[in-house]
Amino acid sequence: QKSSIEKCSVDIQQSRNKTTERPGLLNCPIYWQQLREKCLLFSHTVNPWNNSLADCSTKESSLLLIRDKDELIHTQNLIRDKAILFWIGLNFSLSEKNWKWINGSFLNSNDLEIRGDAKENSCISISQTSVYSEYCSTEIRWICQKELTPVRNKVYPDS
């Protein structure tokens, strides 16, 4: 039994997968912030989690996926105001009773120390200092991401 949040997440991911391949992104678009091999867009309006997910999709991006603790810290270092919360692409899967990223993978329990309950209609937000479980209907800001395409160095023969 999938929750409405899970269905929304799956639908958006599937529609993203159906879109035609685009040329790789070599530089971050204006207004996007480069963080290593990603471009991040921090919203300045608020939305519930599923609307945030949809908004990122319209920008040909996704809600932020965080690979590990190191990436979390680097992302949090960009957040200036301690009081502001941002949705990321992680929510509670009722059917699998686990935290699930919007790309279908499950949270490695060592990656994020989540404050709050793991239960139905819970989604994950980050602040400058912490990671929180919030009701997915809560209206807060969000972070979209685009992956940068790695540029392979060309090797030229000696001239």
Epitope: P29, I30, Q33, F42, T58, D81, I84
Partner: antibody
């Protein structure tokens, strides 16, 4: 509604640092992109750069080595510093709110009224 | 950087006439990323049009914007005395943000 007001010295000596502040009233600085633009007398507009409310910046490459834009959320203002100025930096300096990318690109609105900075010894 | 070229440099018309101002980009600009501003002597620019064709709040409907790719147009359907000013286009689709050199609209 949101209003912006530039302040700072109107005269700066060559090789010194130009410092201006833009005070935001009628709204919070903790959203949007906050921009500086300048206009030399009788010439066109030149974008200097912006700071986002989270503190990240983007500068015009032609000025990048000399410019710093900073933000003070507690005072609801943002600032411009331009180092090693010359006569070519004489201009009216404007601050403006940039709607950035929130689904639509909103453009620069509103603007401050502008302040003339003359670089001369 | 994207260079915006506005034409004509000066446009001389009478009140009641139609004004057509052009802005040409050196490379393609998404229509979402083009704006027009009006500037009167001694004043800050005022946003007229964003997203190439959307009127900003409080802008009369005699102002309209159109275009895509590299060619954009600002049209003022019937000139009022207060419309005589300098008009600037601006692109904000790629960094650095750039402005055109301006078109001066003067009374004939």
């Amino acid at each position: 509604q949101v209003q912006l007001q530039e302040s700072g010295p109107g005269l700066v000596k060559p090789s010194e640092t130009l410092s201006l502040t833009c005070t935001v009233s009628g709204g919070s600085i903790s959203s949007n992109y906050w921009t500086w633009i300048r206009q030399p007398p009788g010439k066109g507009l030149e974008w200097i750069g912006y700071i986002y409310y989270i503190g990240t910046t983007n500068y015009n490459p032609s000025l990048k080595s000399r410019v710093t834009i900073s933000l003070d959320t507690s005072k609801n203002h943002f600032s411009l510093r331009l180092s090693s100025v010359t006569a070519a930096d004489t201009a009216v300096y404007y601050c403006a709110r940039d709607g950035g990318y929130s689904g639509t690109y909103w453009g620069l609105d509103p603007w401050g009224q502008g302040t003339l900075v003359t670089v001369s010894s | 950087e994207i260079v915006l070229t506005q034409s004509p440099g000066t446009l001389s018309l009478s009140p009641g006439e139609r004004a057509t101002l052009s802005c040409r980009a050196s490379q393609s600009v998404s229509s979402s990323h083009l704006a027009w501003y009006q500037q009167k002597p001694g004043q800050a620019p005022r946003l007229l049009i964003y997203g190439a064709s959307s009127r900003a709040t409080g802008i009369p409907d005699r102002f309209s914007g159109s275009g895509s790719g590299t060619d954009f147009t600002l049209t003022i359907s019937r000139l009022e005395p207060e419309d005589f000013a300098v008009y600037n286009c601006q692109q904000y689709g790629s960094s650095p943000i750039t402005f055109g050199q301006g078109t001066r609209l003067e009374i004939k």
